[in-house]
């Protein structure tokens, strides 16, 4: 049998049949079903949803659907001892307290088990002291405070606005600055788009709304108590003092009504410049402490949350491949939510559900994919990507040998303006070709392709006539697959217009107001953007699982490697004297990139010409493509980040959400002018150039003719 016969119908027809089966109305129905009650990780409600999804995936026609459980460290507020922040007077009396929870949205007044806003994994504590406003609490904000303004955060409680970077990085920065507590708040400048009403009349954040979220610095470790290994029945667990990534100071989030009360009394230094001012009617003074009349008043935090080892459940569905059952294409997204999960994650979970249903329909008609497709509903993503990471740790040997690709499926929308894609360069051509075949859902682009509207609205900064595709960072379930295991990965969703909406994420992110109605009324009433995202995600999975030759183009990796090498070289060249003094050369890296480019080009030529009817040669070429991403993995990992092993990409050390290229070199160069031992610092730069050059060269050689 030829590989086409094995899959029963011709590939073109299959893809069309698969895409035609996807229905917006079904996605809408699934979203409604998944968002009526909270599905917090570790709760009975989320276990019940896991069982429901398992049952429905079986009905849809998957070959098997299993629950994979793990016992991981989670964090919850104390039900009888709520968390709050107060302003206390000189007698210690609480003269102001922050709200204990958000006012519920219409129709949800009687819903139980809405977890109040909290910072997951905050230690307990009741610190009191003067307040310092630290802007976004980014690395550069603390540089500004400490180096330029000479403000010492040691022993202070800092208040930082959400946005720009992952909240865990903010907390880490505050800890390093010596703070004894952190208050996180949503400023209207970042979470209230002008001209839009607050929920329930629009998609903006009300003053009582608060963003929940974990504040870990796991660096890819998964369960804090079992780094590197699955949290199974016989796991050896670290003591809490040795747990990975836990914050050491109390942290709590608040809304802008409460933030106003804390910030309006601030004294001390004026904000250094306008970039430190938000949109509240307060001076945005940095502090420390309150102004004149209020100088004897302090801020006190009351945090009583507890960390508990709790059982979580992934749902893993399998659609066995007809020709290469030992090659896995994975579609995964999380199921757990902070509250209702109207966008995060259920807009993604509903899309996955419909993709599974469509694949199941084809399977019931006698079709099978060429390769095995695994579908995953991950648990405890919100608590540090725990479900996906534990499963990948448990199955790492299989995944590193058999994993072709991972497509992530968290929130399908964060806006309704245009497509947003982050992926490995290997998938660029797949994404381009697929979006050229899909219809754009955008107004004004009727009859045009998705590629066209996407390119018009989000053009590539480097290549005219092409859309922007971003680097993978982290903060989602692809992390372990890409950054640790080196499995080619990608993600797609509909996004906002970043030009006109400079707020961070979407305003109601991780709040109680992230409901079904938010999506149905304001973001996507016709569910046409959800359908488009289903087509992109599902289409990618379809092609990856069904194309005879894997739809990876190694030449695109060559292009970006050159770009990243140029970029890191230009950063280093800001220190020409030191480069000369310490004999720092990038020649080896540029040479390796040149070799990669040439070898990739030759490989691509061979890929056009080889005999695709020879299953051994076909498998050999496909394996070279599959293992290319794997070749960028350094088994030793990055310095102090052993689970970030990809040499070309890692989450930024200053913002987990962002991807950094040549991260080892980048981190070695970062703030190098302030290092106490420049010789040692530049020695590390040289070592990192060596590691990068070696890795690129070694990866290139995997594409050479095998003999």
């Amino acid at each position: 049998k030829s590989s086409n016969e094995a899959t029963n119908i011709t590939p073109k027809h299959n893809m069309k049949a698969f895409l035609d089966e996807l229905k917006a109305e079904n996605i809408k129905k699934f979203l409604y079903n998944f968002t009526q009650i909270p599905h917090l990780a570790g709760t009975e409600q989320n276990f019940q949803l896991a069982k429901q999804i398992q049952s429905q995936w079986k009905e849809f026609g998957l070959d098997s659907v299993e629950l994979a459980h793990y016992d991981v460290l989670l964090s919850y507020p104390n039900k009888t001892h709520p968390n709050y922040i107060s302003i206390i007077n000189e007698d210690g009396n609480e003269i102001f307290n922050t709200s204990l929870f958000e006012p519920p949205p219409p129709g949800y007044e009687n819903v139980s088990d809405i977890v109040p806003p909290f910072s997951a994994f905050s230690p307990q504590g009741m610190p009191e002291g003067d307040l310092v406003y630290v802007n976004y609490a980014r690395t550069e904000d603390f540089f500004k405070l400490e180096r330029d303004m000479k403000i010492n955060c040691s022993g202070k409680i800092v208040i930082a606005r959400y946005g720009k970077v992952f909240r865990g990085n903010k907390v880490k920065n505050a800890q390093l600055a010596g703070a004894k507590g952190v208050i996180l708040y949503s400023d209207p400048a970042d979470y209230f788009a002008p001209g839009v009403k607050s929920y329930p009349d629009g998609w903006n954040l009300p003053g009582g709304g608060v963003q929940r979220g974990n504040i870990l610095n796991l660096n890819g470790a998964g369960d804090p108590l079992t780094p590197g290994y699955p949290a199974n029945e016989y796991a050896y667990r670290r003591g809490i003092a040795e747990a990975v990534g836990l914050p050491s100071i109390p942290v709590h989030p608040i809304g802008y009504y409460d933030a106003q009360k804390l910030l309006e009394k601030m004294g001390g230094s004026a904000p250094p410049d306008s970039s430190w001012r938000g949109s509240l009617k307060v001076p945005y003074n940095v502090g420390p402490g309150f102004t004149g009349n209020f100088s004897t008043q302090k801020v006190k935090m009351h945090i009583h949350s507890t960390n508990e080892v709790t059982r979580i459940y992934n749902v893993i569905g399998t659609l066995r491949g007809a020709v290469e059952p030992d090659r896995y294409v994975i579609l995964g997204g999380h199921r757990d939510s902070w509250v209702f999960g109207g966008i995060d994650p259920q807009s993604g979970a509903a899309v996955v559900h419909e993709i599974v249903r469509s694949f199941g329909t084809l399977k019931k008609e006698g079709w099978r994919p060429r390769r095995t497709i695994l579908f995953a509903s991950w648990d405890a993503e919100e608590f540090g990507l725990l479900g996906s990471t534990e499963w990948a740790e448990e199955n790492s040997r299989l995944l590193q040998e058999r994993g072709v690709a991972y497509i992530n499926a968290d929130s399908s929308i964060e806006g309704n303006y245009t497509l947003r894609v982050d992926c490995t360069p290997l998938m660029y051509s797949l994404v381009h070709n697929l979006t050229k075949e899909l219809k754009s859902p955008d107004e004004g682009f009727e009859g045009k392709s998705l590629y066209e509207s996407w390119t018009k609205k989000s053009p590539s900064p480097e290549f005219s006539g092409m859309p922007r595709i971003s680097k993978l960072g982290s903060g989602n379930d692809f992390e372990v697959f890409f950054q640790r295991l080196g499995i080619a990965s990608g993600r797609a969703r509909y996004t906002k217009n970043w030009e006109t909406n400079k707020f961070s994420g979407y305003p109601l992110y991780h709040s109680v107001y992230e409901t079904y109605e938010l999506v149905e009324k304001f973001y996507d009433p016709m569910f046409k953007y959800h359908l488009t995202v289903a087509q992109v995600r599902g289409g990618m999975v379809f092609e990856l699982a069904n194309s005879i030759v894997l739809p990876f183009d190694c030449r695109d990796y060559a292009v970006v490697l050159r770009k990243y090498a140029d970029k890191i070289y230009s950063i280093s060249m800001k220190h020409p004297q030191e480069m000369k003094t310490y004999s720092v050369s990038f020649d080896s890296l540029f040479s390796a990139v040149k070799n990669f480019t040439e070898i990739a080009s030759k490989f691509s030529e061979r890929l056009q010409d080889f005999d695709k009817s020879n299953p051994i040669v076909l498998r050999m070429m496909n394996d070279q493509l599959m293992f290319l991403e794997r070749a960028f993995i350094d088994p030793l990992g990055l310095p102090d980040r052993p689970f970030y092993r990809h040499v070309i990409y890692a989450p930024s050390s200053h913002n987990k959400y962002a991807g950094e290229s040549f991260p080892g070199i980048y981190d070695a160069l970062f703030d190098i002018e302030s290092k106490v031992d420049p010789s040692k610092a530049w020695g590390e730069v040289k070592r990192q150039i060596y590691v990068a050059a070696f890795t690129v060269q070694a990866a290139a050689e995997t594409l050479s003719e095998v003999a």
């Epitope: 958000e102 006012p103 009300p206």
Partner: antibody, heavy 120, light 106 residues
Framework: EVKLVESEGGLVQPGSSMKLSCTAS????????MAWVRQVPEKGLEWVAN????????YYLDSLKSRFIISRDNAKNILYLQMSSLKSEDTATYYC?????????????WGTGTTVTVSS | QIVLTQSPAIMSASPGEKVTISCSAS?????MYWYQQKPGSSPKPWIY???NLASGVPARFSGSGSGTSYSLTISSMEAEDAATYYC?????????FGAGTKLELK
């Protein structure tokens, strides 16, 4: 000057209907939720209904939902309360109020009130 | 619905005396509002979002609390403060008021 002025109330028979209106001035009417709050003589305040900015969403005290309708005309800056099947227990002073915090009601401006007496 | 219980129902205070009026909610609420009403007048907004004084309210007034327990405090009673004070919850529909506390001048 920010002002809310209710229409004249009056004496009506049980079972009959009455429509109250409230004219707003001194602010952009369409930028605010509006509400009706009533007060039985010598008793406390009771929220009756709220309406959102454009009138697309309305919220009522459950016991009044089937008999009272809140509406607004943003072009004319008028808030209405249509009351039907009136009962003696609906006798009260009815206040029109501006809601500063949107859906989550905080009434920062009140009318002077209009008295409705339901009696045979 | 959330029931608000004010205490005391009636109280009297001498000029200069500290006054505290309590408002207890049947279940936790996010914020509390307070209104002042004098005979023959419509209610006036007095304290919003638990602790913010409405425009024109003297600084001797303050509000505090969280969860189910809230209070309005007058640090030093004055004659013009004699009135009825109502609390109102900002949490969920139906919006509810307390029965009122009538504060008289002793």
């Amino acid at each position: 000057e920010v002002k809310l002025v209710e229409s004249e109330g009056g004496l009506v028979q049980p079972g009959s209907s009455m429509k109250l209106s409230c004219t707003a001035s001194g602010f952009t009417f369409s930028d605010y939720y509006m509400a009706w709050v009533r007060q039985v003589p010598e008793k406390g305040l009771e929220w009756v209904a709220n309406i959102n900015y454009d009138g697309s969403s309305t919220y009522y005290l459950d016991s009044l939902k089937s008999r009272f309708i809140i509406s607004r005309d943003n072009a004319k800056n008028i808030l209405y309360l249509q009351m039907s099947s009136l009962k003696s227990e609906d006798t009260a002073t009815y206040y029109c109020a501006r809601d500063l915090d949107g859906y989550y009601g905080y009434f920062d401006v009140w009318g002077t009130g209009t008295t409705v007496t339901v009696s045979s | 619905q959330i029931v608000l219980t004010q205490s005391p129902a009636i109280m009297s205070a001498s000029p200069g005396e500290k006054v505290t009026i309590s408002c207890s909610a049947s279940s936790s609420v996010s914020y509390m509002y307070w209104y002042q009403q004098k005979p023959g007048s419509s209610p006036k907004p007095w304290i919003y979002r638990t602790s913010n004084l409405a425009s024109g309210v003297p600084a001797r007034f303050s509000g505090s609390g969280s969860g189910t327990s809230y209070s309005l405090t007058i640090s030093s009673m004055e004659a013009e403060d004699a009135a009825t004070y109502y609390c109102q919850q900002y949490h969920s529909y139906p919006l509810t008021f307390g029965a009122g506390t009538k504060l008289e001048l002793k």
